[in-house]
């Protein structure tokens, strides 16, 4: 009889341990859910608030028509400038028209004055042709004014109101470009 009672007691204790474990798992699951819910809500709020104040360009970017431009505050070589722009979901500036060139040079005059800024233009090592970073050719009026005497790779930059060329490994500011967000209003 005593053995029977002790077996029942052990079974009850085992049941209790299992229930405690289940409760602990449930509490942990609930805590995890609450935490995920908090992150979800924060993410939703961020998304909603950014959708509310959705300007066509991010903070510190300049808008002109369908494009947003970022003028860097750091120097880097041309290849690193490419990467820096990609990090922002953009590419180095690709000047498509004289109007765009005028806007850029006018903006630079207001912001920083006469410095050098890398754009997405470089010379093909074999043919010597100038190409934009996406492989397209610049229009004839948008070719660098002077040919660099460098034996290394040659890249394009903007200074004052001119497009010039230099060794890609020199340090300059750079300009990134991305498309402006269309207003849904």
């Amino acid at each position: 009889k005593l053995l029977q009672v002790s077996t029942i007691a052990m079974q009850q204790q085992e049941k209790l341990i299992q229930q405690e474990r289940a409760l602990l798992n449930f509490t942990e699951w609930k805590r995890s859910c609450a935490l995920q819910m908090k992150y979800c809500q924060a993410f939703m709020q961020n998304s909603l608030s950014s959708a509310h104040n959705s300007s066509p360009c991010p903070n510190n970017w300049i808008q002109n028509r369908e494009s947003c431009y970022y003028v860097s505050e750091i120097w880097s070589i041309w290849h690193t400038s490419q990467e820096n722009c990609l990090k922002e979901g953009s590419t180095l500036l690709q000047i498509e028209s004289k109007e765009e060139m005028d806007f850029i040079t006018g903006s630079l005059r207001k912001i920083k004055g006469s410095y050098d800024y890398w754009v997405g233009l470089s010379q093909d090592g074999h043919s010597g042709r100038w190409l934009w970073q996406d492989g397209s050719s610049p229009s004839p009026g948008l070719l660098p004014a002077e040919r660099s005497q460098s034996a290394n790779q040659v890249c394009g930059y903007v200074k004052s109101n001119s497009l010039l060329s230099s060794n890609c490994s020199t340090w300059k500011y750079f300009i990134c470009e991305k498309y402006a967000l269309r207003s849904s209003v």
Partner: nanobody, 122 residues
């Protein structure tokens, strides 16, 4: 946790073609751009190509005209079509994703895959 999974590397003869793929799995990371770096033995790592979620494209000077990058935003996947391959294209190709962490530790970040070997040899 987000992971990048590359595929498509291998051995190819000079003049041949290969197509690399890279898919980003996971969450808490909003991707701005994806692309490819490469590193050959004893050489510096170089950017091969990149594509933004807006479809803007940039190529490294040595591959322009031969390589084509494309992406699928819905699948968080980037492809690199490599044509007219040369022995100097031999390298480990690493997929990269640039973006913003959207979880508790927000901020910008870069993710990189394990790399896939591309060997161009006859």
């Amino acid at each position: 946790q987000v992971q990048l999974q590359e595929s498509g590397g291998g051995l190819v003869q000079p003049g041949g073609s290969l197509r690399l793929s890279c898919a980003a799995y996971g969450s808490i990371f909003s991707i701005n751009a994806m692309g490819w770096y490469r590193q050959a033995p004893g050489k510096e790592r170089e950017l091969v190509a990149g594509i933004t979620t807006q479809g803007r494209i940039t190529y490294g000077n040595s591959v322009r005209g031969r390589f084509t990058i494309s992406g699928d935003n819905a699948k968080n996947t980037v492809y690199l079509q490599m044509k007219s391959l040369k022995p100097e294209d031999t390298a480990v190709y690493y997929c990269s994703a640039w973006g913003v962490k959207t979880g508790p530790e927000s901020g910008s970040g870069t993710l990189e895959g394990q790399g896939t070997q591309v060997t161009v040899s006859s």
